[in-house]
């Protein structure tokens, strides 16, 4: 015997209180598949969350984050604070990248500068808190007599220590 509820389309639920007829989902709820016995509560995009897509009777709302924050987690379940380039988010808030590390985005962690010498190359452009070093040609590739493009080691920035 076919389940009468299987005829209920998305946007409705099979109402046991009314002889299993298909009733529309009430306001603030949805059903994304047919044959549902209840409708799910719509997600609320409030506070730090903004509505990217309104809830409908057949699909949940979708949220993103208010300016200064970015989405984390499946379906933007959390909003994390943006930091400036050259910083990373810690439990104490945004902190500058330590010397020898950089972050070129408003999110994520500070990463170590590329070690050019591991590839047998020299440093063409020094790294900063916001940018990785740029590696140049290996010293052997330089023509004889050409001046080295390796700049002097950068001075230690005050308040920063190697990780």
């Amino acid at each position: 015997l076919q389940d009468p509820c299987s005829n209920c389309p998305a946007g409705t639920f099979c109402d046991n209180n009314r002889n299993q007829i298909c009733s529309p989902c009430p306001p603030n709820s949805f059903s994304s598949a047919g044959g549902q016995r209840t409708c799910d509560i719509c997600r609320q995009c409030k506070g730090v969350f903004r509505t990217r897509k309104e809830c409908s009777s057949t699909s949940n709302a979708e949220c993103d984050c208010t300016p200064g924050f970015h989405c984390l987690g499946a379906g933007c379940s959390m909003c994390e604070q943006d930091c400036k380039q050259g910083q990373e988010l810690t439990k104490k808030g945004c902190k500058d990248c330590c010397f020898g590390t950089f972050n070129d985005q408003k999110r994520g962690i500070c990463r170590p500068w590329t070690n050019c010498s591991l590839d047998g190359k020299s440093v063409l452009v020094n790294g900063t808190k916001e940018r990785d070093v740029v590696c140049g040609p290996s010293p052997a590739d330089l023509s004889p007599g050409a001046s080295s493009v390796t700049p002097p080691a950068p001075a230690r920035e005050p308040g920063h220590s190697p990780q």
Epitope: P26, N28, I41, Q44, C63, F69, M78, E80, Q81
Partner: antibody, heavy 121, light 111 residues
Framework: QVQLQESGPGLVKPSETLSLTCTVS????????WTWIRQPPGKCLELVGY???????SYNPSLKSRVTISIDTSKNQFSLQLNSVTAADTAVYFC???????????????WGQGTTVTVSS | QSVLTQPPSASGTPGQRVTISCSGS????????VNWYRQLPGTAPKLLIY???QRPSGVPDRFSGSKSGTSASLAISGLQSEDEADYYC???????????FGCGTKLTVLG
């Protein structure tokens, strides 16, 4: 099970600053809103303001110029500071968890037991 | 003065059904779900109904909520003496970007 506990002085002099801390135990302070709500004697519940775990804040417009809410996720605590208090700020102050937004929909679902703050000289 | 309007008092006898109303505006109840709380003297409010008509686990089905337009109501059937408490409605207010509350309804169980 998450529990909230308010702490701070029960008596504050007029024009001074009211400072309260809420300690969250039995769960993480991450991914929720953390709220201060007050209830003057025999009066209505009033939202003071809230902070999201990652630092977003929103304050009641009537108190905005005097209130600061901060959070320390490493200590699982959040705090309320209310400046230039008057007798009208005498109330029971509740800290509470709010899961509204994100994927939550309960709203303010866990409350501290409340702490009475009297403003008097 | 509260943003949501509730009657200050309501009463009923044991076994009766009582309804408490809550009136708001388009920026709160009209556009957002309603929560209901009960508060016993000297204690914190406890969530009774969320999202208009949903009961958290442990709340008996004697308590039900509904919403229409910019008004909401809480119904308590089979009234019991332990239901005597203050009942508050709450809704998110888009203009204030936060929760607003009613001033509470004191429910008295007679007899």
């Amino acid at each position: 099970q998450v529990q909230l506990q308010e702490s701070g002085p029960g008596l504050v002099k007029p024009s001074e600053t009211l400072s309260l801390t809420c300690t969250v135990s039995g769960g993480s302070i991450s991914s929720y809103y953390w709220t201060w709500i007050r209830q003057p004697p025999g009066k209505c519940l009033e939202l003071v303001g809230y902070i999201y775990y990652s630092g977003y804040t929103s304050y009641n417009p009537s108190l905005k110029s005097r209130v600061t809410i901060s959070i320390d996720t490493s200590k699982n605590q959040f705090s309320l500071q209310l400046n230039s208090v008057t007798a009208a700020d005498t109330a029971v102050y509740f800290c509470a968890r709010d899961d509204y937004g994100g994927n939550g929909y309960y709203g303010v679902d866990v409350w501290g037991q409340g702490t009475t703050v009297t403003v008097s000289s | 003065q509260s943003v949501l309007t509730q009657p200050p008092s309501a009463s009923g006898t044991p076994g009766q059904r009582v309804t408490i109303s809550c009136s708001g505006s388009s920026s709160n109840i009209g556009n957002n779900p309603v929560n209901w709380y009960r508060q016993l003297p000297g204690t914190a409010p406890k969530l009774l109904i969320y999202s208009n008509n949903q009961r958290p686990s442990g709340v008996p089905d004697r308590f039900s909520g509904s919403k229409s337009g910019t008004s909401a109501s809480l119904a308590i059937s089979g009234l019991q003496s332990e239901d005597e408490a203050d009942y508050y409605c709450a809704a998110w207010d888009d203009s204030l970007n936060g929760w607003v509350f009613g001033c509470g309804t004191k429910l008295t169980v007679l007899g």
